[in-house]
């Protein structure tokens, strides 16, 4: 997939920043706001921000610039630089009027067909589980295979370096074609097929990628919020996998929720399947020792483990993946729309 260029974004933060630099007032305000970072700690939802007056003034000046409302893209070049600008500007939007974080990522729906050659799968036993089949589809694709091997190497061995492993995982889920990445991770298993479930759970190399001792979930979030990329992915996830009501309806499309979920893999907030017998997912953290923030911690943890929007999005994608192999397609090579199961 070609990386999206800035020009393809409606209002890229990189472009907006360049425009701002050409305007002395905007440029000064931006620099001032940027230097406010140390004096304005990013507040967690339970905290009220304390904002110096000069920072408020700088924020006010930026409110009329094109930086307000600027966005980034998950697959763009210089993504981290774009996100840095976004979060600097975000303070201008929310200072003195703390709003819930808004996803920095612009919605783009890909309708590019995904070509798969299923005929090559006949080297597998006919009764092979679907996780094996999707792994084979990745192997048969040069790019997917190369990226998968890269994280496989980084995440294996008794002395794997977790930060290197995470970086390679992040690269895989960012650069591999979305259907390949989703097929690999969200492959369906028969209810009693523990081998298949184990393979699926091990897709992200949890022994290396996940912390050996589960940290407190709020500490994990604090760590995540200190990194623009992780913070962006978490906010994107909370935006698009938010259950709108008690029926668990997703606030946006299920496909958008899944994209946001996969975007977390390789960050500090990497989720995974809990067991090899079902498709329940969770963060690798605990709410023990949260003191008077227990309620807030449980809400964060529950957003992963007890989220009917996410559960149904995963289930729908797995049903879709099952259908790929259960239908008699007219030709061994066929095209599947990448966004076929949006609701």
């Amino acid at each position: 997939d070609p990386l999206p260029t800035e020009s393809r974004l409606m209002n890229s933060c990189l472009q907006a920043r360049r425009k701002c630099q050409a305007d002395p007032t905007c440029s000064a305000a931006y620099h001032h706001l940027d230097s406010c970072t140390s004096s304005i700690s990013t507040p967690l939802p339970s905290e009220e921000p304390s904002v110096p007056a000069d920072c408020l003034e700088a924020a006010q000046q930026l409110r009329n610039s094109s930086l307000i409302g600027c966005m980034c893209h998950r697959r763009m070049k210089n993504q981290v630089a774009c996100l840095d600008i976004y979060w600097t500007v975000h303070r201008a939007r929310s200072l003195g009027n703390y709003e819930l974080d808004v996803s920095p990522y612009e919605d783009t729906v890909t309708s590019k067909p995904w070509k798969m050659n299923l005929s090559k799968l006949n080297m597998l036993k006919p009764d092979s589980d679907l996780c094996l089949k999707f792994a084979m589809l990745c192997t048969l694709n040069d790019k997917c295979d190369r990226l998968r091997k890269a994280y496989g190497e980084a995440c294996s061995g008794p002395h794997c370096q977790r930060h290197v492993c995470l970086r390679q995982l992040l690269t895989f889920f960012e650069k591999a074609a979305e259907p390949h990445a989703q097929g690999l991770l969200l492959c369906p298993c028969a209810p009693n097929d523990r081998g298949c479930g184990e393979r699926r759970r091990n897709t992200i190399a949890p022994n290396c990628a996940l912390p050996p001792v589960a940290p407190n979930c709020l500490e994990l979030r604090r760590l995540c919020f200190s990194d623009p990329l992780c913070r962006s992915r978490l906010v994107d996830f909370q935006t698009h996998c938010h259950p709108m009501d008690i029926l668990g309806t997703c606030a946006t499309e299920q496909s958008r929720c899944l994209r946001a979920y996969l975007g977390l893999i390789g960050t500090a907030m990497t989720p995974n399947f809990v067991s090899n017998v079902n498709t329940s997912v969770a963060l690798s953290c605990t709410c023990r020792g949260s003191g008077n923030l227990q309620e807030e911690c449980e809400m964060l943890e529950g957003f992963f483990s007890h989220n009917p929007c996410l559960t149904e999005a995963i289930a729908a994608k797995m049903r879709f993946h099952s259908q790929l192999f259960s239908q008699d397609w007219p030709h061994p090579t066929f095209a599947v729309m990448a966004h076929q199961n949006e609701n």
Epitope: D245, I246, G248, S280, M299, H306, P308
Partner: antibody
């Protein structure tokens, strides 16, 4: 410590009205969906009504649709159930219940209940 | 509406026994199932949620299993305090409760 205290129950004639209240404390009230669940003495539990944390969305069981209205006042940490056109089969202990997670009707805390008797 | 069928409706057992209560849903509810314990004159108490997650503060002798339409609550070694009525509840689509299982002393 989470506390839910119901009030407003009593004896009412068929066709009459009653308003139940539930005072909540010990948690961030506006962050959670709340619900009313009833139980005919000596019988099982029946979910009656629910309301989202913001109060924007309400949900009712078929048996009470058009007759019962759930509402909340987040500034006072109060939950209400307005019951109109009451029938004998509405006789039950009514419990106010807090959801464990905002997006599902799973109840981790319950009040002590208030008895509503509909009889002539 | 999803109908929850609990069995048995009454169960006689002794302290130290291992007991199992079953709950069947009329259609798949994934793992959105909870178990509650209720004692006479008291409000129900949450024991298990998401089919197998133990609620904080609940003794580990209580466990839950199952997914789809078949679920079980197991008490590994009955204690005197466990004699009560147990209800299953689905919360996959709104909420419905099973008819209850009264666990009494043999």
């Amino acid at each position: 410590e989470v506390q839910l205290v119901e009030s407003g129950g009593g004896l009412v004639q068929p066709g009459g009205s009653l308003r139940l209240s539930c005072a909540a404390s010990g948690f961030t009230f506006s962050s959670y969906a709340m619900s009313w669940v009833r139980q005919v003495p000596g019988k099982g539990l029946e979910w009656v009504s629910a309301i989202s944390g913001s109060g924007d969305n309400t949900y009712n069981a078929e048996s009470v649709k058009g007759r019962f209205t759930i509402s909340r006042d987040n500034s006072k940490n109060m939950l209400y159930l307005q019951m109109n056109s009451l029938r004998a089969e509405d006789t039950a202990v009514y419990y106010c219940a807090k959801t464990k997670f905002s997006s599902s009707l799973l109840f981790d805390y319950w009040g002590q209940g208030t008895l509503v008797t509909v009889s002539s | 509406d999803i109908v929850m069928t609990q069995s048995p409706s009454t169960l006689s057992a002794s302290v130290g026994d291992r007991v199992t209560i079953t709950c069947r849903a009329s259609q798949s509810i994934s793992w959105w199932l909870a178990w509650y314990q209720q004692k006479p004159g008291k409000a129900p108490k949450l024991l298990i949620y998401k089919a197998s997650s133990l609620e904080s503060g609940v003794p580990s002798r209580f466990s839950g299993s199952g997914s789809g339409t078949e679920f079980t609550l197991t008490i590994s070694s009955l204690q005197p305090d466990d004699f009560a009525t147990y209800y299953c509840q689905q919360y996959n689509s709104y909420s419905t409760f099973g008819g209850g299982t009264k666990l009494e002393i043999k």
